[in-house]
Interface confidence: medium
């Protein structure tokens, strides 16, 4: 004779207040004949949740039609879940008995617990920008989840990070929990377009983790490189000098020209271009009038990037006698 098995597949069922919980129970045999009842808890104080033979259970419905003789599914749904519904639920097979039906076999039980989804992770970067090769910290926070078990991972451009510390609070029993994690990220020069992702996995999310992101563009400062060059061709009695500011981020930039230490306001033209890695190039042209110049003209291109200390590059202008003559000739 086959032994009847009561199968309750879920050890833990997480439910949300106000929703409907489905408690699964199937049997492997219909013999001995008798009803299946649902209880919360064990022992003499257990609470009857559902009896297929009799009683009124307004919040409970059956998944299958229990009046069908071949039914082996005794799963139930409990509607409008409240915190008072938490506990361990047992489906129990009774055999016909007297003076009452006799308990024959119980399922292993399903613990119903209130589950709360974590809030969307919020990722905050450093307050100030930092240059490449340095380490910056990012924090990720998520709140309001239950139960306490939760998994948090960090990624940079899809690659998992390992240098982080995570805390879940409180440490004891609570209705809901919070997680805070701090990751240390070494900045690379090309990180303007990079992202850090905080990924939170929780049983209530059914395998669909929540993600919070931060752009490293908010945390990185790529300082510019400067190059000042004199163009070989002249325009009339003027020489074109170019200041190329390369590979900087963010875009915030102030450029000034000085002629022998005197700040000039006459920048001729400039162009801003964006590189593939998200950094910028700035080119500024400065026309120097050489008709009456001495030989010792020094031009300085000074750049103040993102509120940092100014950097500059100097160029001693080379003006040949031939150029001077040509200049003189061109003067009206």
């Amino acid at each position: 004779e086959e032994e009847l098995q009561m199968i309750q597949p879920e050890k833990l069922l997480l439910v949300t207040v106000g929703k409907t919980a489905t408690l699964h129970c199937t049997v492997t045999s219909l013999l001995p004949v008798g009803p299946v009842l649902w209880f919360r808890g064990v022992g003499p104080g257990r609470e009857l949740i559902y009896n297929q033979k009799e009683g009124h259970f307004p919040r409970v419905t059956t998944v299958s039609d229990l009046t069908k003789r071949n039914n082996m599914d005794f799963s139930i749904r409990i509607s409008s879940i409240t915190p008072a519904d938490v506990g361990t639920y047992y489906c129990v097979k009774f055999r016909k008995g007297s003076p009452d039906d006799v308990e024959f076999k119980s399922g292993p039980g399903t613990e119903m617990a209130l589950g709360a989804k974590p809030s969307a992770p919020v990722v905050l970067g450093p307050a100030a920008r930092t240059t490449p090769e340095h380490t910056v910290s990012f924090t990720c926070e998520s709140h309001g989840f239950s139960p306490r078990d939760i998994t948090l991972k960090w990624f940079k451009n899809g690659n998992e990070l390992s240098d982080f510390q995570t805390n879940v609070d409180p440490t004891g029993q609570s209705v809901a929990y919070s997680i805070r994690s701090t990751a240390r990220v070494v900045l690379d020069p090309w990180d303007v377009r990079s992202q850090v992702i905080c990924e939170v996995a929780h049983v209530t999310l059914q395998g669909d983790p929540l993600r919070g992101t931060a752009n490293l563009s908010e945390a990185i400062r790529v300082p510019p490189t400067l190059e000042v060059t004199q163009q070989p061709m002249r325009v009339g009695n003027q020489v074109n000098v170019t200041c190329q500011v390369r590979k900087f981020y963010p875009q915030s930039l102030q450029l000034t020209w000085s002629e022998n230490g005197n700040v000039c306001q006459r920048e001729t033209a400039s162009t801003l271009t964006e590189n593939k890695d998200g950094t910028y190039n700035w080119t500024s042209w400065f026309l120097v009038n050489i008709s009456d110049q001495r030989d010792d003209v020094v031009l300085t291109c000074q750049v103040k990037h993102d509120g940092q200390l100014a950097v500059s590059k100097r160029l001693a202008l080379e003006v040949t006698v031939h150029q001077k003559d040509q200049s003189s000739d061109a003067t009206p």
């Epitope: 086959e2 045999s29 219909l30 013999l31 004949v33 016909k96 008995g97």
Partner: antibody, heavy 118, light 107 residues
Framework: EVQLVESGGGLVQPGGSLRLSCAAS????????MHWVRQATGKGLEWVSV???????YYPGSVKGRFTISRENAKNSLYLQMNSLRVGDTAVYYC????????????WGQGTMVTVSS | DIQMTQSPSSLSASIGDKVTITCRAS??????LAWFQQKPGKAPKSLIY???SLQSGVPSKFSGSGSGTDFTLTISSLQPEDFATYYC?????????FGQGTKLEIK
């Protein structure tokens, strides 16, 4: 019409074997527990075995280990394989349907006679 | 095993009579009791289940009562077709067992 028809009875020597069949019609056979009940001539009724919807089986001590109940839902058929037969197994064998949720018999076949004699 | 005892073993009655057959279980069987009618050379016919529930198609002159160990079958107004042997059966636990039968004869 709901109907059960037994067959396969006959005369067999002690120690011999016999297989009874019960053909069901007019209802969804696979949805019911099925029983065999026997009645010796001039005597009362004796329950012989049950097979549940899932194929689980029970027997009284008098036939346990000698009789095997089985079912073939695709053929709407119930069987009773009787081995090591004894003179005391002589009886009319009825198949019956466990009809209500609590397995009370509601439909009976007309019976088939099994005689065990040397 | 649960023993089922019927009384009387036989009973003579006239057409139109009201008769009562009793069945006693050797232990409490709740209300898991059935009654059957059997005529000579025929298969048993189901009359009552769960002590008092009438099987479909059974006339209301048949009624059952009782719970625990003592049960009764009452036939309110005997007709010729009611003369037969009546069996009670417990089906609370395996092996299911029957009473020895009550033979109802015409007086």
């Amino acid at each position: 019409e709901v109907q059960l028809v037994e067959s396969g009875g006959g005369l067999v020597q002690p120690g011999g074997s016999l297989r009874l069949s019960c053909a069901a019609s007019g209802f969804t056979f696979s949805s019911y527990d099925m029983h065999w009940v026997r009645q010796a001539t001039g005597k009362g009724l004796e329950w012989v075995s049950v097979i549940g919807i899932a194929g689980d089986t029970y027997y009284p001590g008098s036939v346990k280990g000698r009789f095997t109940i089985s079912r073939e839902n695709a053929k709407n058929s119930l069987y009773l394989q009787m081995n090591s037969l004894r003179v005391g197994d002589t009886a009319v064998y009825y198949c019956a349907r466990g009809g209500s949720w609590d397995d009370a018999f509601d439909i009976w076949g007309q019976g088939t006679m099994v005689t065990v004699s040397s | 095993d649960i023993q089922m005892t019927q009384s009387p073993s036989s009973l003579s009655a006239s057409i139109g009579d009201k008769v009562t057959i009793t069945c006693r279980a050797s232990q409490d069987i709740n209300n898991y009791l059935a009654w059957f009618q059997q005529k000579p050379g025929k298969a048993p016919k189901s009359l009552i289940y769960t002590a008092s529930s009438l099987q479909s198609g059974v006339p209301s002159k048949f009624s059952g009562s009782g719970s625990g160990t003592d049960f009764t079958l009452t036939i309110s107004s005997l007709q010729p077709e009611d003369f037969a042997t009546y069996y009670c059966q417990q089906y609370v636990s395996y092996p299911y067992t029957f009473g020895q039968g009550t033979k109802l004869e015409i007086k």
